[in-house]
Interface confidence: low
């Protein structure tokens, strides 16, 4: 173990731009201050002298999600009878670089509504709200990622297991299905242009069968009928 109490295993945990820096060790002997900066700016301190091993940096990284950020965790001895003050240059460790636009994980999407009419199935994906602000309002995931954000629909006859896929760069699918057949489906957010962290987890599965439709309506999910 590092006797200076220097933090280690600095890890960015970020989903839909909600961004937390985590580190180790949990220690009764040390407290921590986190600093964050871009390549062009001075360090800004957050989570002053915390005993926790995580720090929410969302407010900083959403200022410009296209920027690359670096954080560092400074370690100080916890105040006790033997401590006369904090060192001028506390030991610290740097985080990996983090670019929110490229590195935030895509959260699990939610199917907002669906409707099967004849041979057409319309599925709408809920546009998740992020903590990115523009003109005082929170932007949706779509407003941040634009045409970079696609959704993939996985769908199959309720009576079989063979999955088909469809893709859209809006939040809506309109696909051809067999009349009178029930279908199940789930969706996944995808950013094809990313080199990594391209895909979200799949949404919960929905089905068009009447029984399940009634159960969903009772629990707050809605079919939209036009």
């Amino acid at each position: 173990a590092d006797t200076t109490g220097r933090a280690y295993n600095l890890t960015w945990k970020s989903t839909n731009f909600k961004t937390i820096l985590e580190w180790e060790p949990k220690s009764i002997d040390h407290v921590y201050t986190v600093q964050i900066s871009t390549r062009l700016e001075n360090w800004k301190s957050k989570c002053f002298l915390t005993a926790e091993t995580e720090c929410d940096l969302t407010d900083e990284v959403v200022k410009d999600v296209g920027q690359t950020y670096m954080a560092r965790v400074l370690s100080y001895p916890a105040r006790n009878g033997n401590t006369t003050g904090f060192p001028e240059e506390p030991p610290f460790r740097n985080s990996p670089e983090f670019t929110p636009y490229l590195d935030t994980n895509l959260g699990q999407p939610t199917i907002q509504s669906f409707e099967q009419v004849g041979t057409k199935l319309n599925v709408t994906v809920q546009d998740a709200r992020t903590l990115v602000r523009r003109n005082g309002t929170f932007l949706s995931l779509r407003a941040v990622f634009g045409k970079d954000l696609n959704y993939t629909l996985y769908y199959w006859r309720a009576s079989s297991t063979g999955k088909k896929t469809a893709t859209t760069n809006t939040n809506e699918f309109l696909i051809d299905v067999d009349k009178g057949e029930n279908y199940c489906f789930s969706v996944q957010a995808v950013i094809p242009s990313r080199k990594r962290k391209q895909r979200s987890p799949e949404s919960l599965t929905e089905c068009t069968s009447r029984e399940q439709g009634r159960a969903r309506e009772m629990t707050g999910h809605h079919h939209h009928h036009h």
Epitope: R142, V144, G146, N171, E172
Partner: antibody, heavy 124, light 108 residues
Framework: QVQLQQWGAGLLKPSETLSLTCAVY????????WSWIRQPPGKGLEWIGE???????RYNPSLKSRVTISVDTSKNQFSLKLSSVTAADTAVYYC??????????????????WGKGTTVTVSS | EIVLTQSPGTLSLSPGERATLSCRAS???????LAWYQQKPGQAPRLLIY???SRANGIPDRFSGSGSGTDFTLTISRLEPEDFAVYYC?????????FGGGTKVEIK
């Protein structure tokens, strides 16, 4: 107020590479797409291609083999390169911002901010 | 490629008159992807209408857009002196995004 300022060489010889840059002032690259459009003398507008802040691109197939659009988020600017130019590439070249809007669950774009244009002449 | 054909090529009208500009697409266009731009000599195009009928910020209500499918229209209810310019329709739904050839609205 977002403004686009563009610059680059105005006079080229055939077979050279056109290179233009567009800087974004008063706003971020993120959340938008960024396009290049050209207009030959006395003619209409032709879309060349676009790029997102992540670097994803779409090009006009008629120019795709010669076009590269790139983005530099650290400088808040994006660039156009068009190789092997000929006299047919003589035009005013514009950069523009593609802004998103919503309508009935769909997600669409319009070009709401334009650069002033750069005149490029290809002549031997 | 979706070809947008604008007509007429030139429209000669007097201030105060109504101008009706047509844009016809070679294939169906989702109206949400249809925009209109105004361009004056020596200037960059200026967004007027997006989504076929929504006016851009700062555009006077004498400008209106309509249409769907393959036929779209830009109407200027009463021409002002500053409205004499070239007008372009554009679709941004299918790559390559394309512009119409333009309609020049000139003073009669």
């Amino acid at each position: 107020q977002v403004q686009l300022q563009q610059w680059g060489a105005g006079l080229l010889k055939p077979s050279e590479t056109l290179s233009l840059t567009c800087a974004v002032y008063g706003g971020s690259l993120s959340g938008y797409y960024w396009s290049w459009i050209r207009q030959p003398p006395g003619k209409g507008l032709e879309w060349i291609g676009e790029i997102g802040a992540s670097g994803s691109t779409r090009y006009n197939p008629s120019l795709k083999s010669r076009v590269t659009i790139s983005v530099d988020t650290s400088k808040n600017q994006f660039s156009l390169k068009l190789s092997s130019v000929t006299a047919a590439d003589t035009a005013v070249y514009y950069c523009a911002r593609d802004t998103p809007y919503y309508y009935e669950g769909g997600y669409y774009y319009y070009m709401d901010v334009w650069g002033k244009g750069t005149t490029v002449t290809v002549s031997s | 490629e979706i070809v947008l054909t604008q007509s007429p090529g030139t429209l000669s009208l007097s201030p105060g008159e109504r101008a009706t500009l047509s844009c016809r697409a070679s294939d169906s266009v989702d109206s949400s992807y249809l925009a209109w731009y105004q361009q004056k000599p020596g200037q960059a195009p200026r967004l007027l209408i997006y989504g076929a009928f929504s006016r851009a910020n700062g555009i006077p209500d004498r400008f209106s857009g309509s249409g769907s499918g393959t036929d779209f229209t830009l109407t200027i209810s009463r021409l002002e002196p500053e409205d004499f310019a070239v007008y372009y329709c554009q679709q941004a739904g299918v790559v390559p995004y394309t512009f119409g050839g333009g309609t020049k609205v000139e003073i009669k």
